[in-house]
Interface confidence: low
């Protein structure tokens, strides 16, 4: 014979666990029902009665399957460097991302707790690692044969034009200027080599280098905003 | 000579995880990030994480709950951990440096480890 | 994510012939890079920074683009030009590949 489906509450056999969506109400003593997911537990279930549930006040939730006496109150409003990537409702906490040019310096479980405005590279220096959801920008100074001459959060350092005759030379954060009116654009097809190695970009002292890598938010964050690192520009 | 090579299990079954080496020479992690690749049998690239010179990570957000990358510097091994395989995960495996200037993002791949996952 | 569409998925051209394949990019990249993969074999660099060649790329291609919308052309279709290209962006992460254009002989 198939065994008897037992409903809540009921007292578990010995050793045994309660069901999905069951939990064991140590004062009872019995397996009871769990509330579903935008509600709580409004009264607890007795030996005799099952769980009560109600739905979670506004500005309150529940993610989960549950027997909480009361709703998780919903993270407060985003700021203005956030955008509200999910809403605060019966069944889900609001979700506060960063928005466009601002990456995670502090993140929570869900979303971001603080924002920083992505660093620039100031000219001289080019992106070497774009800023993600949760990591800064890092600068570069421009290789020999390279110049970034804007202020930029995406600019990477590019080839100098090739010129038939040079009018100026370019230099890390400024182009070569032709003199004929037909320039080879940055390097002729064919022609392209990797930048040269480590060693000889030494040579390359202008503009001083910045380190290499941005500081981690673990350092940045106890000691409140941060200067910009050399080769980039808070703003 | 700058050169990269993977080596994996080849063979791993449904819910196991994946642990892939990729050894390098010809260059230091510490002055050149690394990144993972895949290509799953006639389909095209898919990009999976990179441990940059400094250690610090970038993740492909989809894949971030089952992937885990690290490195050891001084043997020039870069890792590759992947959780919960499913037959999807069938592919080839690519490790590729990153170009720290900028010019290229990959400028120098592996041959690449071949990954079937099935039971 | 930045989703990069590549087109055609699929082409024949002639020795000779001028071939042209685009990359859409689904919001603004800054620049574009390209690889080429030949069956059984591991992806070269081809083009970087929307238009420079890698070394030892021959003449023949270039590369343009800007904004959302980029293009690989190779000016006259040689046999060893047969084989997989592929864009990538790395402006923002996750770093997207596109679906890659095949290109065969006819």
């Known amino acids: 014979l198939p065994a008897q489906v037992a409903f809540t509450p009921y007292a578990p056999e010995p050793g045994s666990t309660c069901r999905l969506r069951e939990y064991y109400d140590q004062t009872a003593q019995m397996c009871c029902s769990k509330c579903s997911p935008g509600q709580h537990a409004k009264v607890f279930c007795t030996k005799t009665s099952d769980t009560v549930c109600d739905s979670c006040e506004d500005s309150t939730y529940t993610q989960l399957w549950n027997w909480v006496p009361e709703c998780l109150s919903c993270g407060s409003r985003c700021s203005s460097d956030q955008v509200e990537t999910q809403a605060c409702t019966r069944e889900q906490n609001r979700i506060c991302t960063c928005r466009p040019g601002w990456y995670c310096a502090l993140s929570k479980q869900e979303g971001c707790r603080l924002c920083a405005p992505l660093r620039k590279c100031r000219p001289g220096f080019g992106v070497a690692r774009p800023g993600t959801e949760t990591s800064d920008v890092v600068c570069k100074p421009c290789a020999p044969g390279t110049f970034s001459n804007t202020t930029s959060s995406t600019d990477i350092c590019r080839p100098h034009q090739i010129c038939n005759v040079v009018a100026i030379p370019g230099n890390a954060s400024m182009d070569a200027v032709c003199t004929s009116t037909s320039p080879t654009r940055s390097m002729a097809p064919g022609a392209v080599h990797l930048p040269q190695p480590v060693s000889t970009r030494s040579q390359h002292t202008q503009p001083t280098p910045e380190p290499s890598t941005a500081p981690s938010t673990s350092f940045l964050l106890p000691m409140g905003p941060s200067p910009p690192a050399e080769g980039s520009t808070g703003d | 000579e700058v050169q990269l090579q993977e080596s994996g299990p080849g063979l791993v079954a449904p819910s196991q995880s994946l642990s892939i080496t990729c050894t390098v020479s010809?260059?230091?992690?510490?002055?050149?990030?690394v990144h993972w690749v895949r290509q799953p049998p006639g389909k095209g690239l898919e990009w999976l994480v990179v441990i940059w010179s400094d250690g610090g990570t970038t993740y492909n957000s989809a894949l971030k709950s089952r992937l885990s990358i690290s490195k050891d510097n001084s043997k020039s091994q870069v890792f590759l951990k992947m959780n919960s395989l499913q037959t999807d995960d069938t592919a080839m495996y690519y490790c590729a440096r990153h170009d720290d200037d900028g010019y290229y993002a990959m400028d120098y791949w592996g041959q690449g480890t071949t990954v079937t996952v099935s039971s | 994510d930045i989703v990069l569409t590549q087109s055609p998925s699929l082409m024949s051209a002639s020795p000779g012939e001028k071939v042209t394949m685009t990359c859409s990019a689904s919001s603004s990249v800054g620049y574009m890079y390209w690889y080429q993969q030949k069956p059984r074999s591991s992806p070269k660099p081809w083009i970087y920074?929307?238009?420079n060649l890698a070394s030892g790329v021959p003449a023949r291609f270039s590369g343009s683009g800007s904004g959302t919308s980029y293009s690989l052309t190779i000016s006259s279709m040689e046999v060893e030009d047969a084989a997989t290209y592929y864009c990538q962006q790395w402006s923002s992460d996750p770093f997207t590949f596109g679906s890659g254009t095949k290109l065969e002989i006819k």
């Open positions: 010809g260059f230091s992690l510490t002055s050149y990030g």
């Open positions: 920074l929307t238009s």
